[in-house]
């Protein structure tokens, strides 16, 4: 039975040209996280973090995506086109797959509130 829950940074906004941390956290389960896949709204892969093999960064983003912190992802040099949904897919054993959703809004304005549901360490 899948008992875990995914907490995410929820709906966030950030300034054009700035950076943002995409972060998910799996709780309420003892399942082992074997891999986390990060995908965009069109289901194209941004990055993979495998517990043993390390990071895979999709080549189109290699200059704009930094691995971490932790299982999260830092998206840099934001453009208006980065606005949209982002999904973290946690592959776990023995539970199976958990999925979280983050909505990122990139703002033209010089003041962009970056609100998160939980504090990123």
């Amino acid at each position: 039975m899948m008992t875990g829950t995914i907490e995410t940074t929820g709906n966030i906004s950030a300034k054009k040209g700035g950076s943002v941390i995409l972060q998910c956290h799996l709780s309420s389960t003892m399942a082992q996280v074997t891999q986390v896949n990060w995908e965009q709204h069109d289901h194209s892969l941004l990055a993979i973090r495998n517990a043993e093999l390390g990071w895979h960064i999709y080549p189109a983003f290699k200059d704009r995506v930094a691995p971490g912190p932790g299982l999260g992802l830092t998206l840099q040099s934001l453009t208006m086109n980065d606005t949209g949904e982002y999904f973290c897919t946690y592959h776990t054993y023995p539970d199976g797959t958990y999925r979280g959703r983050i909505f990122l809004e990139v703002l033209e304005s010089s003041v962009a509130e970056h609100s998160a549901r939980f504090q990123i360490p």
């Epitope: 896949n37 995908e39 194209s44 892969l45 993979i48 495998n50 043993e52 093999l53 960064i57």
Partner: antibody, heavy 119, light 107 residues
Framework: EVQLQQSGPELVKPGASVKISCKTS????????IHWVKQSHGKSLEWIGG????????IYNQIFRGKATLTVDKSSSTAYMELRSLTSEDSAVYFC????????????WGQGTSVTVSS | DIVMTQSHKFMSTSIGDRVSITCKAS??????VVWYQQKPGQSPKLLIY???YRFTGVPDRFTGSGSGTDFTFTISSVQAEDLAVYYC?????????FGGGTKLEIK
Amino acid sequence: EVQLQQSGPELVKPGASVKISCKTSGYTFTEHVIHWVKQSHGKSLEWIGGFNPNHDGTIYNQIFRGKATLTVDKSSSTAYMELRSLTSEDSAVYFCTRAAKLLFAMDYWGQGTSVTVSS
Amino acid sequence: DIVMTQSHKFMSTSIGDRVSITCKASQHVSNAVVWYQQKPGQSPKLLIYSPSYRFTGVPDRFTGSGSGTDFTFTISSVQAEDLAVYYCQQHYSTPWTFGGGTKLEIK
């Protein structure tokens, strides 16, 4: 120049074990994962697993758990794969490969080691 | 495990022809697909990754495309040295899996 030099062909008896080596050169050994791939005669490729020398992490394809053991010797930049309890099904060419940095693609391959299991 | 299916085990072509090899994943693999070339008696070589980026030194007649479950590897103008078996492979989830291979034969 990146190179992966594998040990020579092996002829072994059923039930025995064999240890294949893969000596790497031309890059920083700890910065790249080493993978192992099996190719049975005239067949496709099967991923056995990978070893991450950066933090000694090992991952196996479930079907090779208990069959293959992956290790490395960082001092000589050499990766090893031991195969145990060999049967005719294990007769194949085994390749060591290097994964690209921050990319799950196997960019350089060893020449392959032929293992023949026969009594 | 994700199954990668290359529907054609053999493809026959002529020098200068355009040829496309297809690969279908049993489930969504996004853009996490790689193509390798294996010439007779040699080790596989990385050609294309992610799934449209050419590896260093790979001629531009080789291209890749696709996303999700359907992928295509194309040689725009086949040369004699392209005689080989071509494999797709997914790394979206472990265990990494390969297609059965497509052997390109020259008429």
